[in-house]
């Protein structure tokens, strides 16, 4: 079976404060089994933005129906963007494990820049 790739096609996205940001992510394989999570930043200080299995994550909506078994699109929309949302966002695949899922592979990241609303 094909090795899983995580594709974040946009290196950067510019969004005006108050608007909605779309962060794109697709995967190329359904294996290994396990959830997708989105993070802002990397390393131990990263912020969890979206977890396919838990929530709710009130400002986040998925572009596709991620509950469908063969879904490979894990793009998200984040509403009501503020300057504090700026940063690099990573789409990360986890492998199902016990008791905890294990991080398997990360996308290259999409840098979100926030343009201040003109006052």
């Amino acid at each position: 079976e094909e090795e899983l790739q995580i594709i974040q096609p946009d290196k950067s996205v510019l969004v005006a404060a108050g608007e909605t940001a779309t962060l794109r992510c697709t995967i190329t394989s359904l294996f290994p089994v396990g959830p997708i999570q989105w993070f802002r930043g990397a390393g131990p200080g990263r912020e969890l933005i979206y977890n396919q299995r838990e929530g709710p994550f009130p400002r986040v909506t998925t572009v596709s129906d991620t509950t469908k078994r063969n879904n490979m699109d894990f793009s998200i929309r984040i509403g009501a963007i503020t300057p504090a949302d700026a940063g690099t966002y990573y789409c990360v695949k986890f492998r199902k494990g016990s008791p905890d899922d294990v991080e398997f592979k990360s996308g290259a990241g999409t840098e979100l820049s926030v343009r201040a609303k003109p006052s």
């Epitope: 404060a17 108050g18 802002r40 930043g41 390393g43 131990p44 200080g45 990263r46 912020e47 969890l48 933005i49 977890n51 838990e54 929530g55 994550f57 009130p58 400002r59 986040v60 009501a80 503020t82 300057p83 504090a84 949302d85 609303k117 006052s119």
Partner: antibody
Framework: DVQLVESGGGVVRPGESLRLSCAAS????????MNWVRQAPGEGLEWVSR????????DYAESVKGRFTISRDNSENTLYLQMNSLRAEDTAVYYC????????????WGLGALVTVSS | ETVLTQSPATLSVSPGERATLSCRAS??????LAWHQQKPGQAPRLLIY???RRATGIPDRFSGSGSGTDFTLTISSLQTEDSAVYYC??????????FGGGTKVEIK
């Protein structure tokens, strides 16, 4: 129902240490950033510290930086605040507060734990 | 840092009357402003977020409005149980998270 219950408050002398705990239930604790907010007698609310969902990212108010340490145990659904080198001006009720999302307001508050620093 | 200024410091209103509380930010916070209610001897409770959205279980006599730098919390028909201190909180720029100094609502 979301519940946040603080414990560990008490009376200490200046320069001593104390550790507060906050037991969380009713939500997916590991998915949310958590905060400590304090209120000195007869005063308003002062944000003290924040920790991200995974525990690797922390922020502190200038007034406590270098003296207080926030941490969490996601397996035990518990938030902590280690307070060292306590001063009289740290006397307050300390509330733990759940964050609505990674960049948001505080949607649930604990009942508070009273810390009194007095010689 | 964004400073939040609440006015008036104290507001005395008769039951059934309207109470209007103000919160002004030193720089724009968009619509990222919340209101919390704290009754004597109790923990704060979220009332309003995103300037105008009522939190779960909050009666509709509480409403919020405003954007940018000027915000208002209105209690349309004051009840005796609304006697409390009300704090605004911004979450547009952080850290630190900032609260206003509070407005104490008293029943006449």
């Amino acid at each position: 129902d979301v519940q946040l219950v603080e414990s560990g408050g008490g009376v200490v002398r200046p320069g001593e240490s104390l550790r507060l705990s906050c037991a969380a239930s009713g939500f997916s604790f590991s998915s949310y950033a958590m905060n400590w907010v304090r209120q000195a007698p007869g005063e308003g609310l002062e944000w003290v510290s924040r920790i991200n969902s995974g525990g690797g990212g922390t922020d502190y108010a200038e007034s406590v930086k270098g003296r207080f340490t926030i941490s969490r145990d996601n397996s035990e659904n518990t938030l902590y605040l280690q307070m060292n080198s306590l001063r009289a001006e740290d006397t307050a009720v300390y509330y733990c507060a759940k964050q609505y999302d990674w960049n948001g307001f505080f949607d649930y508050w604990g009942l508070g734990a009273l810390v009194t620093v007095s010689s | 840092e964004t400073v939040l200024t609440q006015s008036p410091a104290t507001l005395s209103v008769s039951p059934g009357e309207r109470a209007t509380l103000s919160c002004r930010a030193s720089q724009t916070v968009g619509s990222k402003l919340a209101w919390h209610q704290q009754k004597p001897g109790q923990a704060p409770r979220l009332l309003i977020y995103d300037a105008s959205r009522r939190a779960t279980g909050i009666p509709d006599r509480f409403s919020g409005s405003g954007s940018g730098t000027d915000f208002t919390l209105t209690i349309s028909s004051l009840q005796t149980e609304d006697s409390a201190v009300y704090y605004c909180q911004q979450y547009y720029y952080w850290p630190p998270y900032r609260f206003g100094g509070g407005t104490k609502v008293e029943i006449k």
